[in-house]
């Protein structure tokens, strides 16, 4: 009888998740990404904050930088120079936008164990990086780029026209940072550090968004950001390259823009160095269905960069916009001219292609009714990539190796059978020449990071297995999760359902739809998470569902591009269709259905609530877009075209939340926004509120003073507590 008695006592000690667990991050997990510094070595910050160098082949490790040194300047980050002579230490981190921040940098000399004195770096610095070889430094200070041949040398100033909110050198402006580059930097060293390429963004003519930052002073501050909304004037971008060996000799040389791009408004989308004397630039028309990849060569005789038309490769979409969320970037082959790139095949699935002379002659490397998602590394004999091919689940990610050093190329799934139940969603990080690699598994089980041999794929060791988390979860009643699909009118709607621990199909449960639904997004993923919705299922007995409808990614262009020029229609329809299907399953209380979303999800949840279906009792919109005329040009126009009469103004007007104000009369609506949201401006919610007041529709609202789009810090606790009360009230659940 003992085993069953133990089992019973275990049952009794099991507890539900609490909101406090979620807000305290009690069940957060760790990942391990090696900071590779060679084919067989990586750096890692140990638990006691020493910076340790590990050599995989010798099995040895040693501390290259002590926690004492880190602490002496309050360093929160570090960067080792490639020649291993210096380390930069980063402190006084001050966040700006999503990726950008400023910091103070100190250079520590490993050879003598002292900080470099003399010619210290100015502060605060906007971006700093080592050259890929040696220990040259490039940095951006007050929107200008500086170069140091050695850390102790005086700086050489490369640009002089940098001006706050006007001219940005080596760093992106707001819209390029958020919507195009997805980085805090806009400068790129050539592979051996001979050249430095950089972007200059001229925001002089861009309209400015201004909002109050209340702070603690008598008068609020006004934050001004050049922010092009749909149809507005855009930044003017130019790309320059300077020879860092003799920077004063000819100075920065501008890289020419392809003629077919320069003929109208355009964007620069990415830069990839191929060799020290060959660079690849990607450009995009403002109407983002044409992208041009241009390969440019250094002309020694003229000291200029030549981009022959024969080395221009055009990628055009006839059914939507170019690429997925962004246009993919090339991964060059060893011949330094041909490359691998992901783009749509003739069947409308994103796959890896090999391009040599022309895109028309591209050789398709992967194919099938699934999508290649990322090319990690190309070596002389292997290409490593991720896809969602395995077992036809779009929300999974496995790592594959294609042998390209022999014919026919053979494909092997590296991860599919490693920890099949625990791990179905991977990413990878490769050392030089793919000698070794780390696999990071995000779920659906507890995340685990492992180290592997790049030739044999053998697991060498576990880098992080989240044992503490595993132990902490042993007495927690976690909700059940299932990922399934609905087939509706030739559309496949994948969904994730989070069910209460003691779920009983014969009972009725309140349903909460969590929606994002933005173009090229994916919510239904086989990943581990213990978050707010886990708590709602575990403790409050709700069923939560996430549905990937039209416009979402990795299931082919038909689904992805269905929303082209029609945002706010099919995304909403598909959430509603799914809800109807869930009701048919028999365990949903159709009088207690809610929907909530954040950002794009707030837009969709608002439109769903105002759809007039009578399906939803209540809903929440956090930081929603309310009109596409209020959002950033780069993002909005990609999917919607221009808000002009001869383009797509009509749908811009038809797709606003405000136009549906009347329909909110029969739902309980909670509208939430941060007043210092630099991304989706408070203006969006202000206009919804105004329209609801004008229509005399009651609603609830919460603003978060001086909070941005992330509603972080104490606001997070307040937000989730407030939303919990709202939902419990809506679902008549006792507090």
């Amino acid at each position: 009888l003992r085993p069953s008695r133990v089992h019973n006592s275990e049952e009794n000690t099991m507890r539900a998740l609490t909101l406090k667990d979620i807000l305290n991050g009690t069940f957060s997990y760790k990942t391990f990404f090696p900071n590779w510094i060679s084919g067989q070595e990586y750096l890692h910050q140990s638990a006691d904050n020493n910076i340790v160098l590990y050599n995989i082949e010798t099995g040895q490790s040693y501390t290259i930088l002590s926690n004492r040194t880190m602490k002496s300047v309050n360093a929160s980050n570090y960067g080792l120079s490639p020649d291993r002579q210096f380390v930069y230490l980063e402190s006084d981190y001050s966040k700006l936008w999503r990726y950008s921040y400023t910091a103070t940098y100190y250079i520590y000399d490993l050879s003598n164990g002292e900080f470099v004195r003399g010619n210290e770096l100015p502060r605060p610095i906007q971006y700093l990086c080592w050259s890929p070889v040696g220990s040259k430094l490039a940095y951006v200070y007050q929107n200008n780029i500086y170069l140091k041949q050695r850390p102790g040398d005086p700086p050489f100033q490369i640009t002089f026209n940098g001006r706050e909110n006007k001219i940005f050198n080596g760093i992106p402006d707001w819209v390029y940072e958020e919507e195009m580059l997805a980085t805090k930097y806009a400068l790129w060293w050539s592979p051996n550090g001979k050249f430095l390429a950089y972007a200059e963004f001229n925001d002089t003519d861009i309209p400015v968004i201004a909002y109050s930052y209340y702070g603690d002073e008598q008068y609020p501050r006004t934050i001004n950001i050049p922010y092009p909304k749909a149809g507005a004037k855009n930044p003017v971008v130019r790309i320059f390259i300077i020879d860092t060996t003799y920077p004063a000799y000819v100075g920065p040389q501008e890289v020419p823009v392809p003629a077919m791009i320069a003929s109208s408004d355009y964007y620069f989308s990415w830069l990839t160095w191929v060799t020290d004397e060959r660079v690849c630039l990607q450009w995009l028309k403002r109407v983002q269905n044409v992208s041009v990849l241009s390969i440019c060569d250094f002309r020694e005789d003229w000291q200029t960069w030549d981009c022959p038309k024969t080395q221009e490769h055009i990628e055009e979409s006839r059914t939507g916009w170019a690429g997925g969320f962004f246009v993919s970037t090339p991964v060059f082959s060893y011949d330094a001219i041909s490359y691998y790139k992901i783009f749509s095949d003739k069947d409308g699935y994103k796959h890896i292609h090999y391009i040599k002379d022309t895109v028309e002659n591209a050789i398709q490397i992967t194919s099938g009714k699934w999508e290649a998602i990322n090319i990690f590394r190309v070596t002389q004999d292997s290409l490593f990539y991720s896809s969602n091919e395995f077992e036809e689940y779009p929300g999974r990610r496995n790592i594959y190796r294609i042998s390209i050093g022999s014919y026919p190329p053979s494909k092997k799934c590296v991860t599919c059978h490693l920890r099949k139940e625990r791990c179905q969603y991977y990413t990878a990080s490769f050392s030089d020449y793919a000698k070794y690699y780390a696999l990071v598994c995000y779920g659906p089980g507890i995340p685990i990071s492992t180290l592997h041999d790049g030739r044999t794929d053998q697991e060498i060791k576990i880098l992080e297995e989240n044992k503490e988390l595993e132990n902490a979860l042993k007495n927690i009643q976690l909700p059940k999760e299932e990922i399934k699909k609905l087939e509706v009118d030739e559309i496949t709607l994948w969904y994730k359902m989070i069910l209460p621990p003691q779920f009983d199909r014969s009972k009725k449960y309140p349903l909460l739809i969590q929606v994002y639904g933005g173009p090229c997004s994916q919510s239904v993923r086989s990943v581990f998470a213990v978050n707010w919705i886990s708590y709602l299922a575990s403790k409050e007995g709700m069923v939560i569902a996430l549905v990937d409808g039209r416009g979402t990614a990795f299931q082919g262009d038909k689904l992805l591009y269905a929303v082209y020029r029609k945002l706010g229609v099919y995304e909403v329809e598909d959430q509603i269709t799914a809800v109807r299907k869930f009701i048919e399953m028999g365990f949903i209380d159709e009088k207690r259905i809610a929907i909530w979303g954040w950002s794009y999800g707030g837009y969709v949840s608002s439109l769903a609530l105002a759809s007039g279906t009578g399906l939803f009792k209540c809903g929440i919109a956090v930081a929603p877009v309310s009109s596409w005329e209020y959002y950033a040009s780069v993002y909005t126009e990609r999917f919607m075209g221009l808000p002009t009469k001869d383009d797509n103004l009509e749908h811009y007007k038809n797709s606003t939340v405000m136009a549906r104000a009347e329909y909110f009369r029969n739902v309980d609506y909670l509208l939430i926004h941060g007043t210092a949201d630099d991304n989706v401006h408070f203006q969006n919610s202000a206009q919804i509120a105004k329209a609801l007041v004008n229509a005399q529709v009651d609603f609830q609202a919460m603003w978060y003073s001086d909070q941005n789009h992330g509603l972080s810090g104490l606001s997070t606790n307040h937000l989730y507590t407030h939303m919990t009360h709202f939902l419990k009230q809506c679902f008549s659940l006792s507090d």
Partner: antibody
Framework: EVQLLESGGGLVQPGGSLKLSCAAS????????MSWVRQAPGKGLEWIGE????????NYTPSLKDKFIISRDNAKNTLYLQMTKVRPEDTALYYC???????????????WGQGTTVTVSS | LVMTQSPASLSASVGETVTITCRAS??????LAWYQQKQGKSPQLLVY???TLADGVPSRFSGSGSGTQYSLKINSLQPEDFGSYYC?????????FGGGTKLEIK
């Protein structure tokens, strides 16, 4: 030992047709790209076209695209060149050639047959 | 792409070093092969990727070049080296040959 043996050459009248064959042995024919090359008497080499291992890609020199058809039968280890609408200037020694896969994604012509002669004359 | 080979012919003695050049009308990015053809025989691959020697080719042969200009160098000519030499690009179809260089014994 690798062998490529062309056959099917001979005398053909202008405007006529002819089908050349190339029998392969000594290597895994089904994994090789194959090409046809011709050489007019006393002249240089002229590339006619190529075919990939599974016949999904066939490329021709533009001037011959509409009159020559390259095909293969991997089960028979044989490469074909169907010639139509021939003219006197098509008189040449016709070689088939095959070769190793070269990284990245192209093929050299490592192996050549001894050639078969086609004479176009009335 | 047009491949221009020079010289069309040259005579040299055993033991000498000769260089044959090949110019492409556009960059072919090292996608170049060299062949040797002896009288009445089929061509034979000597060099690919502009500078890699094919299996069994003596080390006195060497290929070089980049962009549009390529050359084949034969050091210390041997009696068996006399014949015709052709370059061929593999950059984009059609994979054209150069006009050939006839190397004769002096």
């Amino acid at each position: 030992e690798v062998q490529l043996l062309e056959s099917g050459g001979g005398l053909v009248q202008p405007g006529g047709s002819l089908k050349l064959s190339c029998a392969a042995s000594g290597f895994d024919f089904s994994t090789y790209w194959m090409s046809w090359v011709r050489q007019a008497p006393g002249k240089g080499l002229e590339w006619i076209g190529e075919i990939n291992p599974d016949s999904s890609t066939i490329n021709y020199t533009p001037s011959l695209k509409d009159k020559f058809i390259i095909s293969r039968d991997n089960a028979k280890n044989t490469l074909y060149l169907q010639m139509t609408k021939v003219r006197p200037e098509d008189t040449a020694l016709y070689y088939c050639a095959g070769g190793y896969y070269r990284y990245p994604y192209y093929y050299t012509m490592d192996y050549w047959g001894q050639g078969t002669t086609v004479t176009v004359s009335s | 792409l047009v491949m221009t080979q020079s010289p069309a012919s040259l005579s040299a003695s055993v033991g000498e070093t000769v260089t044959i050049t090949c110019r492409a009308s556009g960059s072919i990015h090292n996608y170049l092969a060299w062949y040797q053809q002896k009288q009445g025989k089929s061509p034979q691959l000597l060099v690919y990727n502009a500078k890699t020697l094919a299996d069994g080719v003596p080390s006195r042969f060497s290929g070089s070049g980049s962009g549009t200009q390529y050359s084949l160098k034969i050091n210390s000519l041997q009696p068996e080296d006399f014949g015709s030499y052709y370059c061929q690009h593999f950059w984009s179809t059609p994979y054209t040959f150069g006009g050939g260089t006839k190397l004769e014994i002096k």
